[in-house]
């Protein structure tokens, strides 16, 4: 599941990881664009083993994964503000 939406909360992530997470281990991804209280983009990944991690948005693997997910759903996602689940 991929979720992208704007939030009025402050930054959620206190530390970030660049370590690759295989797709089969991921349950949900949340993208929080910069702004509205947090000066940076945040990517939060829920793993199937009931753990959660903030991923460095600059990590190549997450950028590739996001691109694949965006292409898969580009025809259905509204712009610029959206919250969408992608199986």
């Amino acid at each position: 599941v991929l979720e992208v939406y704007y939030t009025s909360l402050r930054c959620r992530c206190v530390q970030e990881s660049s370590v690759f997470i295989p797709r089969r281990f991921i349950d949900r991804i949340q993208i929080l664009p910069r702004g509205n209280g947090c000066p940076r983009k945040e990517i939060i990944v829920w793993k199937k083993n009931k753990s959660i991690v903030c991923v460095d948005p600059q990590a190549e693997w997450i950028q590739r994964m996001m691109e694949v997910l965006r292409k898969r759903s580009s025809s259905t996602l509204p712009v610029p503000v959206f919250k969408r689940k992608i199986p």
């Epitope: 959620r12 206190v14 949900r28 829920w46 083993n49 009931k50 753990s51 959660i52």
Partner: antibody, heavy 122, light 107 residues
């Protein structure tokens, strides 16, 4: 307001089964990311994690006790349960239930019950 | 399993003292550590999460530090209300494991 409260038998004999109930309010175990865990503390000693149950009925157990533990939930009644079979005097402790919510920042066991004292004695 | 070795097991300090409690993990836990405070007869409450971040309502005299496998909780100037047991918890992987606890007493 999140609250949790444990209940149990108080006293039981060796070889019996300990049944504990955690009744909570202020959150739902049907909500994504929500879980309840059980932790125990023998008098004057440290904390020991026992088990977690999650919104999707995923369960995790302490392997040192796994074959004696069963965790379950009743989502509609806002309750979680722990059973420990074949108890011994070493199981005498205060038993706590605690909430965990998988959000960022992740703080496992952010809310705790008051604890219930369980004594195993012959 | 990840073992958490906490020291000291007990200590006595005077009001205003700087106090440090340490937890050492048997492997790198990547800051996935929480410090709990437990006052006599009460349930534990989280004080510091992800090794260095103060939970809501925690006085600024508390701080956390460390990385890798060694982590510390420091009280910069001890106050009487800080008399309590302190426990570390690693949540890097299951089974979650606590340190053995530190009993902090006031001289």
């Amino acid at each position: 307001q999140v609250t949790l409260k444990e209940s149990g038998p108080g006293i039981l004999q060796p070889s019996q089964t300990l049944s504990l109930t955690c009744t909570f309010s202020g959150f739902s175990l049907s909500t994504y990311g929500m879980g309840v865990g059980w932790i125990r503390q023998p008098s004057g000693k440290g904390l020991e994690w026992l088990a977690n149950i999650w919104w999707d009925d995923d369960k995790y157990y302490n392997p040192s006790l796994k074959n004696r533990l069963t965790i379950s939930k009743d989502t509609s009644n806002n309750q979680a349960f722990l059973k420990i079979t074949n108890v011994d005097t070493a199981d005498t402790a205060t038993y706590y239930c605690a909430r965990s919510e998988i959000v960022m920042p992740y703080v496992p066991f952010d809310y705790w019950g008051q604890g219930v004292m369980v004594t195993v004695s012959s | 399993d990840i073992q958490m070795t906490q020291s000291p097991s007990s200590m006595s300090a005077s009001l205003g003292d700087r106090v440090t409690i340490t937890c050492q993990a048997s492997q790198d836990i990547g800051n996935d550590l929480i410090w709990f405070q437990q006052k006599p007869g009460k349930s534990p409450r989280p004080m510091i999460y992800y090794a260095t971040n103060l939970a809501n309502g925690v006085p600024s005299r508390f701080s956390g530090s460390g990385s890798g496998s060694v982590y510390s909780l420091t009280i910069s100037s001890l106050e009487s209300e800080d008399m309590a047991d302190y426990h570390c918890l690693q949540f890097k992987q299951y089974p979650f494991t606590f340190g053995s606890g530190t009993k902090l007493e006031i001289k």
